[in-house]
Interface confidence: low
Amino acid sequence: ATIKLHDQSIGTQQWEHSPLGELCPPGSHRSEHPGACNRCTEGVGYTNASNNLFACLPCTACKSDEEERSPCTTTRNTACQCKPGTFRNDNSAEMCRKCSRGCPRGMVKVKDCTPWSDIECVHKESGNGHNI
């Protein structure tokens, strides 16, 4: 297999000559060999931009209350999300919280719980939304 970088096919040997001079392409890091780059190991490390790093960034392991949304590739870190039945508000650093079991009396559920938001309820009469 080959990867295409800047219209230049580059093989998957241990190191590759960087097409950007001193910078190595995403998915690799600077080698001890001048002008060469080492590829990151799939599932172990990644770099998501052209770089001058001497090592790939380590892949993140999902926390115990999370599951993997997409695996770590050589160019992208692991993406984690809350396990089914739990949620964490967007861009929040808090732990995953259990989804609400139902809506308060007089309200009806209009949106299921997702890994990013709790269920959403609206008043039966007014239709005004309310996040639990």
Partner: antibody, heavy 116, light 109 residues
């Protein structure tokens, strides 16, 4: 609720190109991997390939030379093309969303028959 | 098929049945296993993920386990609506892709 819908011609002639499209609704096409899986009549499931939102592909080695997958984020679609089809490509074709290494949502499938 | 499943299994209502899935170090040995249920003339449905986790809505009669390079699906309190084809699936590192078992047709007698 995420829904996936396969569409495309149900009949393809031998040696021609099979073209299918999967349309995603009720959810984002970004941040996920998307797969195609097929099932020949009376047989088991066979993974065809996967694509991520950035267009990075990963194909079944046995089909790699004939398969092309792309993604259109604006239309929320990911098409599949298989070149030089034969009767062996007759199957039910499913598209699915990959949550990490789990296919959690599947389309209902579309049957493609290869015949002259 | 890369993963080996028995082609058929059967049981009477209320019984417990187990379906096996045998692989190798490059697939089941180093990756998590998912199980899919395919009812007649329908698309596969995720039944068990990450070896032993049930998606919401799947009864706790269904359970999964993994040991070494093999996995198994157990169904207790068998019901007539469990009659379906069951497939195991996992990632295969050497092939760089998804692999499935050949499927097991479960008959409720």
């Amino acid at each position: 609720q995420v829904q996936l819908q396969e569409s495309g011609p149900g009949l393809v002639k031998p040696s021609e190109t099979l073209s299918l499209t999967c349309t995603v609704s009720g959810g984002s096409i970004s941040d996920y991997y998307w797969s195609w899986v097929r099932q020949s009549p009376g047989k088991g499931l066979e993974w065809i390939g996967s694509i991520d939102y950035a267009g990075s592909t990963n194909y079944n080695p046995s089909l790699k030379s004939r398969v092309t997958m792309t993604i259109d984020k604006s239309k929320k679609q990911f098409p599949l093309k298989i070149d030089s089809v034969t009767a062996a490509d007759t199957a039910m074709y499913y598209c699915a969303r990959q949550l990490g290494r789990i296919s959690d949502y599947w389309g209902q499938g579309t049957l493609v028959t290869v015949s002259s | 098929y890369v993963l080996t499943q028995p082609p058929s299994a059967s049981g009477t209502p209320g019984q417990r049945v187990t379906i096996s899935c045998a692989g190798s170090s490059s697939n089941i040995g180093g990756n998590t296993v998912n199980w899919y249920q395919q009812l007649p003339a329908t698309a596969p449905k995720l039944l068990i993920y990450s070896n032993n986790q049930r998606p919401s809505g799947v009864p706790d009669r269904f359970s999964g386990s993994k040991s070494g390079t093999s996995a198994s699906l157990a169904i207790s309190g068998l019901q007539s609506e469990d009659e379906a084809d069951y497939y195991c699936a996992t990632w295969d590192d050497s092939r760089g892709g998804w692999v499935f078992g050949g499927g097991t047709k479960l008959t409720v007698l």
